[in-house]
């Protein structure tokens, strides 16, 4: 059977006026997954995103990540979109510098 990913979005200062937002998916099976940043619901172009490899996490499941740089103050326009085994979810950028809670999706 399939194991849905836990999705976690974090933010960090990149440079003056910019922040890097990172979306991590972990503990999912099988390994096929779509993870992408969207602006106003539209996927960002590939050249503005950085992806990590889909790697085993040691529990028979997998993990991966995608990151992009955005302008501070525009966070509300951006979401991380995840699709896995026929299910999907959308994840906002957290406010401030705090980590976003993990969300398990079924």
């Amino acid at each position: 059977g399939s194991v849905p990913p836990m999705v976690n979005v974090t933010r960090s200062e990149a440079s003056e006026g910019n922040i890097t937002v990172t979306c991590r998916a972990s503990s999912f099976y099988p390994r096929n997954i779509t993870l992408t940043w969207r602006q106003d619901g539209v996927s960002l172009s590939h050249d503005t995103q950085q992806w990590g490899d889909v790697l085993p996490d040691g529990n028979g499941t997998y993990q991966t990540w995608v990151a992009t740089r955005i302008c501070q103050g525009e966070e509300q326009r951006f979401t991380c979109y995840m699709e896995h085994s026929g299910n999907h979810s959308t994840h906002p950028v957290p406010s401030g510098n705090s980590h976003h809670h993990h969300h398990h999706h079924h």
Partner: antibody
Framework: EIQLVQSGAEVKKPGSSVKVSCKPS????????IYWVRQAPGQGLEWIGY????????IYNQQFKDRATLTVDKSTSTAYMELSSLRSEDTAVYYC???????????WGQGTLVTVSS | EIVLTQSPATLSLSPGERATLSCSAS???????LHWYQQKPGQSPRLLIY???NLASGVPARFSGSGSGTDYTLTISSLEPEDFAVYYC?????????FGQGTKVEIK
Amino acid sequence: EIQLVQSGAEVKKPGSSVKVSCKPSGYAFTSNNIYWVRQAPGQGLEWIGYIDPYIGRIIYNQQFKDRATLTVDKSTSTAYMELSSLRSEDTAVYYCSRSGERSNFDYWGQGTLVTVSS
Amino acid sequence: EIVLTQSPATLSLSPGERATLSCSASSSISSNYLHWYQQKPGQSPRLLIYRTSNLASGVPARFSGSGSGTDYTLTISSLEPEDFAVYYCQQGGSLPLTFGQGTKVEIK
């Protein structure tokens, strides 16, 4: 086949409100944003706002922020746009549209004509 | 707000002729955020070209798009009778999302 079906034409009095519905089909309702756009007779296209049906986030064009209300009913996979304090210049065709993978508006509803007249 | 100015407002041409439509932005925008739509009388707009130069599904190859920065162009290499319509450019780079005022391509 992806379709967005909107409610029928409305005639409203100045000062009243109108609520237009949009029911998409052919894809997972919560996977794409729903945008609203209007077009006055013989005029161009004007973006009102959008809603992310999955998380409920709404982004408005500031010009409509005080009068437009966007909502979704996930149980019926339907999106709504309500416009209050109607005036004659709100007479227009109101469209819903779906955000696309690579563009803001990839599929459109058939439009709903709202006529504001005393 | 980014203002998109389309020119000309009306283009009168005959079938078989080449149509060149311009869209000028008040501020520079990434080519990833410039799209074109076609609208025929009594119909909803239809996505024609996305991200400056990519044809939407089902759009004939006689349509093409180009441009960068503040200047973008939609070209119809040889007009067919069904191409006579209004064309809108639209930017998604900054809020509010905006459209040009449209160029009407009419039969001469």
